[in-house]
């Protein structure tokens, strides 16, 4: 069952989404999973105490990018 | 770094089957969405279909269920199994992997060659 | 399925020159949250296709500052503000929101005058 709305996180985050901490937001099923599911690391909150982990092929935001592009969980759509 | 090296294309007459590999080091397949593209001699880019995380797959639906795409996660390969290959199919083969949090394939095979021909 | 529109399928320019390069979606390219997953790749013959721009605007790491998207809802542009002689290639515009499937452009190639 879909969980309830949770809150606003960042630019990439209009709608509320509704991954609970330990899940992130799948766009191509839509729907949240568990994030290890997942190939590319989802960028921390806003306050996280720690960069977000980043592989060789996740690229920093160089062009048009603004603080919380990306936060985790990723939104549902709602 | 994440690397995908392709084999098994080739020569194959028209109406046959064709087996294609792609093995992946440096990431493992049951995380994220991993892509069969192609692109005929000349011609621009096509997604043929992806296998994802738990082995659900999907397909570009103008191949009319000929193709097929599975895996081998103790081997950490993943395959794409042509049938009813006719001469539009020829064309480099290219496995690739899915960014899922920006959805553009960051990591690409080198892509083998399959010619349908008699 | 979206179909992807590039212009011009081909043209010849200069090093030094200012490459345009425009591509434009059969419907609009907005997700429902917000973003616009439309990217371009570039690639060479005989080598696999190489990601150059993401979400419109966003260069891929390592990818020189030459290179800028630009765009919203369904038009779109590449430019290279200063043509150099490895970027002589085939560039493809891709479309992500709407998938699957994914789609692609038919490419521009960009040659020599």
């Known amino acids: 069952m879909r969980r309830g709305p949770r809150s606003l996180r960042g630019r990439d985050a209009p709608a509320p989404t509704p991954c609970v901490p330990a899940e992130c937001f799948d766009l191509l099923v839509r729907h949240c999973v568990a994030c290890g599911l997942l190939r590319t690391p989802r960028p921390k909150p806003a306050g996280a105490s720690s960069p977000a982990p980043r592989t060789a092929l996740q690229p920093q935001e160089s062009v048009g990018a603004g603080a919380g592009e990306a936060a985790l969980p990723l939104p549902g759509l709602l | 770094e994440v690397q995908l090296v392709e084999s098994g294309g080739g020569l194959v007459q028209p109406g046959g089957s064709l087996r294609l590999s792609c093995a992946a080091s440096?990431?493992?397949?049951?995380?994220?969405?991993w892509n069969w593209v192609r692109q005929a001699p000349g011609k621009g880019l096509e997604w043929v279909g992806y296998?994802?995380?738990?082995?659900?797959?999907y397909y570009n639906p103008s191949l009319k269920s000929r193709f097929t795409i599975s895996r081998d996660t103790s081997k950490n390969t993943f395959y794409l199994q042509m049938n009813s290959l006719r001469a539009e199919d020829t064309a480099v083969y290219y496995c690739?992997?899915?960014?899922?949090?920006?959805?553009?394939?960051?990591?690409w095979g080198q892509g083998t060659l399959v010619t349908v021909s008699s | 399925d979206i179909q992807m529109t590039q212009s011009p399928s081909s043209l010849s320019a200069s090093v030094g020159d200012r490459v345009t390069i425009t591509c434009r979606s059969s419907?609009?390219?907005?997700?429902?949250?917000?973003?616009?997953?439309l990217h371009w790749y570039q690639q060479k013959p005989g080598k696999a296709p190489k990601l150059l721009i993401y979400?419109?605007?966003n260069r891929f790491s390592g990818v020189p500052s030459r290179f800028s998207g630009s765009g919203s809802g369904t038009d779109f542009t590449l430019t290279i503000s200063s043509l150099q002689p490895e970027d002589f290639a085939t560039y493809y515009c891709?479309?992500?929101?709407?998938?699957?499937?994914?789609?692609f452009g038919q490419g521009t190639k960009v040659e020599i005058k």
């Open positions: 690739a992997g899915l960014n899922d949090l920006y959805l553009y394939f960051d990591v």
């Open positions: 440096g990431d493992s397949i049951t995380s994220g969405y």
């Open positions: 296998i994802s995380y738990s082995g659900s797959t």
């Open positions: 419907q609009s390219l907005v997700h429902s949250n917000g973003n616009t997953y």
């Open positions: 979400k419109v605007s």
């Open positions: 891709s479309q992500s929101t709407h998938v699957p499937p994914f789609t």
